[in-house]
Amino acid sequence: GSMGHAPKVGRLIYTAGGYFRQSLSYLEAYNPSDGTWLDLADLQVPRSGLAGCVVGGLLYAVGGRNNSPDGNTDSSALDCYNPMTNQWSPCAPMSVPRNRIGVGVIDGHIYAVGGSHGCIHHNSVERYEPERDEWHLVAPMLTRRIGVGVAVLNRLLYAVGGFDGTNRLNSAECYYPERNEWRMITAMNTIRSGAGVCVLHNCIYAAGGYDGQDQLNSVERYDVETETWTFVAPMKHRRSALGITVHQGRIYVLGGYDGHTFLDSVECYDPDTDTWSEVTRMTSGRSGVGVAVTME
């Protein structure tokens, strides 16, 4: 990545790290308004299976692992990228390494959910306070989950699907911060590990993933009012370990693995027409990216 200053533009879709033959250190940003990609400052350490989020206009890269020819190291790292300076800086590490982690943000705090360290599959969850640069454990999930999809809706944290070390999961659970407790919610129609999970228009969407047999292109959404999961239009590509985010009322899915190929495809879902369209390609195929959108 280049080390020059990043252009000061509006909302960009950032994609950090990922995997293709080895873990990657790329940071790239897609501008949906003009279809261009920016090459930004590399992560200080390559990583895949990480998660991305934005707090206070800063991009955070959380967990993952560095799978390289020299070895394989799960990461407890939290790194912060400032779009104004195009620079990364390390923050306080998590209590444990978490590969294939999920993250969500509530009230400016980052929740790191599940993930793995070697063959240990975590049910633990910890919360980061940026103003103190501190992590603190909160209540553990009811289920061990790696490849977990995490989303926040109405100040509640949802953990969806994943892999518990024995089975891929269709179960989902919800964390109530005020009570510091988890409760199971309605299970998805489909087993999904490594799915993309996000919130759009008061619904939680789960896109793609892996059911223990095959990569999926199906997509379903959870209505918190009716507590039901309903299928919507499928993606054009089957994919697991994909990146996902929401930009201006549309869902974007980035990359992933289809069982044979590392995808460069980026698809966009329009809820008004219930359709997916190919909008761009990443500069190279990859899985296990961390994705987030800058605030305006």
């Epitope: 299976g49 063959c119 095959d214 069982g259």
Partner: antibody
Framework: EVQLVESGGGLVQPGGSLRLSCAAS????????IHWVRQAPGKGLEWVAS????????LYAKSVAGRFTISADTSKNTAYLQMNSLRAEDTAVYYC??????????????WGQGTLVTVSS | DIQMTQSPSSLSASVGDRVTITCRAS??????VAWYQQKPGKAPKLLIY???SLYSGVPSRFSGSRSGTDFTLTISSLQPEDFATYYC?????????FGQGTKVEIK
């Protein structure tokens, strides 16, 4: 019947290349992690490489990293080990194995019969 | 890398004997240890996974146990078909490593 059958072994000169195949039947390789394990003549077992069916990520022993490539073709239900820059110390019987986590917590519960690779001038 | 030190390297026993083979991990591997049986010219066969779980179809005379970083394979009553080489393997962390093997021979 659940089965793995390796092929592609043989005699090759130092610096040469071979591609081993591992054909699966009775199960889908997309549902399992696939591993290659080797055994030098009269020696013990050595893990070589693995591929994860969910993320596509691969892992290699340091002794082969950068020279060997594991891959899988789900349409052919076959896994491969591309071996380049072969050395005398790569001489071994190469086994393909699978682990299905729901069966045996990452332990390799199905093995092929092995294929012999001899690296010699 | 995690070393799996297996002992003894060989042993002689008679049919009906109780046989114990030990693997010591150089650091914690939780319970992520498997045991395999291999006969000459054949592929290994899984006996025990997760330190103590008997794999399906394996006779109940085989058992596994864990005490900290020490792992034990026990054959309660050795049968003629059990004469083979046995390997432990840790899959707790990359790279997966095997013990050097224990050859069980007829006394």
């Amino acid at each position: 019947e659940v089965q793995l059958v390796e092929s592609g072994g043989g005699l090759v000169q130092p610096g040469g290349s071979l591609r081993l195949s591992c054909a699966a039947s009775g199960f889908a390789i997309s549902a399992s992690s696939i591993h290659w394990v080797r055994q030098a003549p009269g020696k013990g077992l050595e893990w070589v490489a693995s591929i994860d069916p969910e993320t596509g990520e691969t892992l290699y022993a340091k002794s082969v990293a950068g020279r060997f490539t594991i891959s899988a073709d789900t349409s052919k239900n076959t896994a491969y080990l591309q071996m380049n820059s072969l050395r005398a110390e790569d001489t071994a019987v190469y086994y393909c194995a699978r682990s299905a986590a729901s069966d045996a917590a990452y332990a390799a519960n199905v093995w092929g019969q092995g294929t012999l690779v001899t690296v010699s001038s | 890398d995690i070393q799996m030190t297996q002992s003894p390297s060989s042993l002689s026993a008679s049919v009906g004997d109780r046989v114990t083979i030990t693997c010591r991990a150089s650091q914690s591997v939780s319970s992520a240890v498997a045991w395999y049986q291999q006969k000459p010219g054949k592929a290994p066969k899984l006996l025990i996974y997760s330190a103590s779980s008997l794999y399906s179809g394996v006779p109940s005379r085989f058992s596994g146990s864990r005490s900290g970083t020490d792992f034990t394979l026990t054959i309660s009553s050795l049968q003629p078909e059990d004469f083979a080489t046995y390997y432990c393997q840790q899959s707790y962390s990359f790279p997966s490593t095997f013990g050097q093997g224990t050859k069980v021979e007829i006394k």
